[in-house]
């Protein structure tokens, strides 16, 4: 029982974890332009994996994909490679993962299959969690070795009177819901793997030995089941499943454009 | 067609206090920010405040800070300037004028104006 | 503030000919976000509000016609009507619609020679 929750709960959380990872490599608030000490602009600057977006002051937003591949910064292209890593493995994660839980029966199954099966899934979710925490974390550090730059030279001034001021950009929303999916996964393939402990038969594997007792015999078998009786009773051994109620997953919501400006 | 048409204007004592009020027309005007910039007489313009669309961004001019609020209710597609503590540099002509939604933030529609003198 | 300057502060052009006026902001309006210019141009004639002919650096508001055509970026802007006509005749502002609080150029007067 407490292997099927084990199992189950780990599933839900990797679950969760692999929506967020997907939800944050799709966002476009990865940077957003930071308002404190700068400048008040009229227009809101941020930039996703994808495209870089502006938000007028009117609420208008207009964004623009990268259309280059050769052009764009390799830690951009890094963080891009693992970000899709996580999400296909998380992908096939959840695959197995949904073959593998205690609660489905399929055929003829073995509980060893089942093991192998939670412990590949969590391998799985684990690699997930840490190429997207990798991938957050690369960008986030990007951002601030950025940030730092363009503050040491936040005023460059051209031919001495006129200036330009540089656009920084800080942590945006995506960074922390990467960080939060990314450690969702993690804890979930560490809840697999410890499920699959309890899923792997042991190894001492006792046959079936029938004791004949006068006038009847009853066959003692191993792995909790019930002993049969002999005597012409053909009733199968069947093992019941506590399946337990399984939440749905909350609606992703994603943010709303706010009225910022 | 859209219209904006500013009221409230008039002769006040330095000091004294004044509301300006825009009414608009013949557009959403929920969905547009909208600004107040005033003509002192014979000069160049000078932008005084700003309101979006919700109310939750807010700016003025750093000339009038502290004494002029701009407020705006959506129910009745009206936009106010409160005007406290006036001063003779203050006089001019004051119109509201929508901020275009895709225009860059420039001012894509003005109202007529109304005429805002301060004198003792 | 952004110190917005318009040169020359008044201009006497026959008709027919090309009208140029110029503007300096003190800091870019470039925004490096979209690439896009945020300055504004307006013109006003006597005893009226102003009117919106350029947006963008260089994209004409609606209605207005083709002789006028907006261009320059980061700090550096021109708006040129190509062939001026008497309706033209009137006091142009430049804009900077990047930073709050914006700012107005001191304007342009704009006669017929």
């Known amino acids: 029982m407490a292997v099927t929750a084990c199992q189950g709960l780990g599933f839900v959380v990797s679950l969760i974890g692999i929506a967020g990872i997907i939800a944050a490599t799709c966002m476009d608030q990865w940077s957003t332009q930071d308002l404190y000490n700068n400048p008040v602009t009229a227009v809101f600057n941020y930039q996703g994996l994808w495209r870089s977006c502006v938000r007028e002051s009117s609420g208008f937003t207009e964004c623009r994909g990268y259309f280059t591949l050769l052009g764009l910064p390799a830690m951009l292209q890094a963080v891009r490679a693992l970000m899709i890593v996580g999400i296909v493995l998380g992908a096939i994660g959840l695959l197995v993962s949904i073959f593998a839980l205690k609660c489905i029966r399929i055929g003829s199954m073995e509980d060893s299959a089942k093991a192998n099966m939670t412990l590949t899934s969590g391998i799985m979710f684990i690699v997930s969690g840490l190429c997207a925490i990798a991938g957050v974390s690369v960008f986030a550090n990007m951002l601030v070795t950025n940030f730092w730059m363009s503050t040491a030279n936040m005023y460059t001034g051209m031919g001495g009177m006129v200036q330009t001021v540089q656009t920084r950009y800080t942590f945006g929303a995506a960074l922390f819901v990467g960080w939060v999916a990314g450690g969702l996964t993690l804890i979930g393939g560490v809840m697999m793997c410890i499920a699959c402990r309890g899923l792997a038969p042991e190894e001492t594997n006792y046959k079936a030995v029938s004791y004949h007792a006068s006038g009847h015999s009853v066959a003692y078998k191993p792995g909790g089941f019930k002993a049969s009786t002999g005597f012409g009773s053909n009733t199968k051994n069947k093992k019941i499943y506590d399946g337990g109620a399984r939440t749905e997953d909350e609606v992703q919501s994603y943010p709303s454009k706010h009225d910022y400006v | 067609e859209v219209q904006l048409v500013e009221s409230g204007g008039g002769l006040v004592q330095p000091g004294g206090s004044l509301r300006l009020s825009c009414a608009a027309s013949?557009?959403?005007?929920?969905?547009?920010?909208i600004h107040w910039v005033r003509q002192a007489p014979g000069k160049g313009l000078e932008w005084v405040a700003y309101?979006?669309?919700?109310?939750?961004?807010?700016y003025y001019a750093d000339t009038v800070k502290g004494r002029f609020t701009i407020s705006r209710d959506n129910a009745k597609n009206s936009l106010y300037l409160q005007m406290n503590s006036l001063r003779a540099e203050d006089t001019a002509v004051y119109y509201c004028?929508?901020?275009?939604?895709?225009?860059?933030?420039?001012?894509?529609?003005w109202g007529q104006g109304t005429t805002v003198t301060v004198s003792s | 503030d952004i110190v917005m300057t318009q040169s020359p502060d008044s201009l006497a052009v026959s008709l027919g000919e090309r009208a140029t006026i110029n503007c300096k902001s003190s800091?870019?309006?470039?925004?490096?976000?979209?690439?896009?210019?945020?300055l504004a141009w307006y013109q006003q004639k006597p005893g009226q509000p102003p009117k919106l002919l350029i947006y963008?650096?260089?994209t004409r508001a609606s209605g207005v016609p083709d002789r006028f055509s907006g261009s320059g970026s980061g700090t550096d802007f021109t708006l040129t009507i190509s062939s001026l006509q008497a309706e033209d005749v009137a006091v142009y502002y430049c804009?900077?619609?990047?930073?709050?609080?914006?700012?107005f150029g001191q304007g342009t007067k704009l006669e017929i020679k």
């Open positions: 004028a929508r901020g275009g939604y895709d225009t860059r933030n420039a001012m894509d529609y």
């Open positions: 013949g557009f959403t005007f929920s969905d547009y920010g």
């Open positions: 309101i979006s669309r919700g109310s939750s961004t807010i």
């Open positions: 800091q870019s309006l470039l925004n490096s976000g979209n690439q896009k210019n945020y």
């Open positions: 963008g650096a260089s």
């Open positions: 804009q900077n619609d990047l930073y709050y609080p914006l700012t």
